[in-house]
């Protein structure tokens, strides 16, 4: 059998059932052209935080190389919400009505939704189970993750945004620890100054004293 | 590499419980839907059932809803199908197969729907 | 339910030649949701294109998708030996999914 390898969340959460029909959005696109600019072995990405060359870890999208292109598979997705998310709108109905907006083929749902069973139907994802960060066509909301248990929850996981993690306090991740949390060191090596403290994202920054010139540990 | 493989085919009597599963590996079996396709002999292939993701929703074909159960262990890299109350039509050779994946792109999340791994088979007999 | 329906049932052609399989949906599909699969005896199916025009991984150029709304082509441009199988074109536009009956190519 033929395949690539491709990077996601695994989460601990079991989903429940969607609730709730949403008014699908149009502007839907045909087929994914065969060429693309996304280029290297990794597009890391943390969870709540901007794109940009941060730490990877089994949560985080990575390329997914194919023959004639390359493209970021989802797994934990950049929390980009469209602006479009403000203007959508939800029926208020409860729970297991049979209504819906019907809308023609191809037309996607909005953000905080999923494709429904009935065409031309969306979804409403279930809060702190599951989330589509984006106008999608997918027929089931991507997965919340559970943080790490050597992390720390800094936003929870809505229908909107998946849950955003941070290493916890006195511990960090950076490029050079992608896949766990590391302790902080505790004081500058002799002859150098603390000029920052650690944070979640790096390890305290020291200085020369003389020189004034600065590294992280 | 990436892989599936099916086991827990054989010989049933109609009327009978059967459960077949699907063991993936390499790839993040969380981040995918798997479907169950079936070929009966001398005919084309069938789509059965499919589960997104991590277990999320699961759709049926008309043929077997109600008898059939889609179900996933993703601790264990699993997929089941429980089949209950056997028929004779259902004897066929049955596959699970990995759906491509979902891309983010241009602001929009993607499915980009084709199955793209596919098991080897395991076959089921139902026969008195 | 969408029901596919492909033609010819049988494609006789010889090596070399072009071959055209036809795949029409008796509702309209959306070019997103609509795929072509190679099936050879005793193997598993192997996808060959989604979305009705992208080729999966590691599929040769030979083989190309067309079409929109109910009328869908899979295009193998010069047969090879390893090209004489069934093809099904299958649609994921509306629950439940559906194949079609399937396009046998043999060599003439």
């Known amino acids: 059998a033929s395949g690539t390898e491709a990077a996601a969340a695994t989460p601990s959460k079991v989903w429940g059932s969607s609730a709730g029909r949403i008014e699908p959005r149009g502007g839907g696109r045909g087929a994914l052209p065969t060429s693309m600019g996304q280029h290297g072995p990794s597009a890391r990405a943390r969870a709540g935080r901007a794109p940009g060359p941060r730490p990877a870890r089994e949560a985080s999208p990575r390329l997914r190389v194919h023959k004639t292109f390359k493209f970021v598979v989802v797994g934990v997705l950049l929390q980009v919400v469209p602006s479009s998310a403000a203007t959508i709108k939800l029926h208020d109905q409860s729970i297991g009505t049979q209504q819906w907006e019907h809308s023609p083929l191809g037309e996607l749902c909005p953000p905080g939704s999923h494709r429904s069973e009935h065409p031309g139907a969306c979804n409403r994802c279930t809060e702190g189970v599951g989330y589509t960060n984006a106008s999608n066509n997918l027929f089931a909301c991507l997965p919340c993750t559970a943080c790490k248990s050597d992390e720390e929850e800094r936003s929870p996981c809505t229908t909107t945004r998946n849950t955003a993690c941070q290493c916890k306090p006195g511990t960090f991740r950076n490029d050079n620890s992608a896949e766990m949390c590391r302790k902080c060191s505790r004081g500058c090596p002799r002859g150098m100054v603390k000029v920052k403290d650690c944070t979640p994202w790096s390890d305290i920054e020291c200085v020369h004293k003389e020189s004034g010139n600065g590294h992280n540990i | 590499q990436v892989q599936l493989v099916e086991s827990g085919g054989g010989v049933v009597q109609p009327g009978r419980s059967l459960r077949l599963s699907c063991s993936a590996s390499?790839?993040?079996?969380?981040?995918?839907?798997i479907h169950w396709v079936r070929q009966a002999p001398g005919k084309g292939l069938e789509w059965v059932a499919v589960?997104?993701?991590?277990?999320?929703?699961?759709y049926y074909a008309d043929s077997v809803k109600g008898r059939f159960t889609i179900s996933r262990d993703n601790s264990k890299n699993t997929l089941y199908l429980q089949m209950n109350s056997l028929r004779a039509e259902d004897t066929a050779v049955y596959y699970c197969?990995?759906?491509?994946?979902?891309?983010?792109?241009?602001?929009?999340?993607?499915?980009?729907?084709?199955?793209?791994?596919w098991g080897q088979g395991t076959t089921v007999t139902v026969s008195s | 339910e969408v029901v596919l329906t492909q033609s010819p049932g049988t494609l006789s052609l010889s090596l070399g030649e072009r071959a055209t399989l036809s795949c029409r949906a008796s509702q309209s599909v959306s070019s997103s949701y609509l795929a072509w699969y190679q099936h050879k005896p005793g193997q598993a199916p192997r996808l060959l294109i989604y979305?009705?025009?992208s080729r999966a991984t590691g599929i040769p150029d030979r083989f190309s998708g067309s079409g929109s709304g109910t009328n869908f082509t899979l295009t193998i441009s010069r047969l090879e030996p390893e090209d004489f199988a069934v093809y099904y074109c299958q649609q994921y536009g509306s629950l439940p999914f559906t194949f079609g009956p399937g396009t046998k190519v043999d060599i003439k």
């Open positions: 979305g009705t025009s």
């Open positions: 197969a990995r759906d491509q994946g979902v891309l983010l792109r241009f602001g929009e999340l993607r499915g980009y729907y084709g199955m793209d791994v």
């Open positions: 589960m997104w993701y991590a277990g999320s929703n699961e």
């Open positions: 390499g790839f993040t079996f969380s981040s995918y839907g």
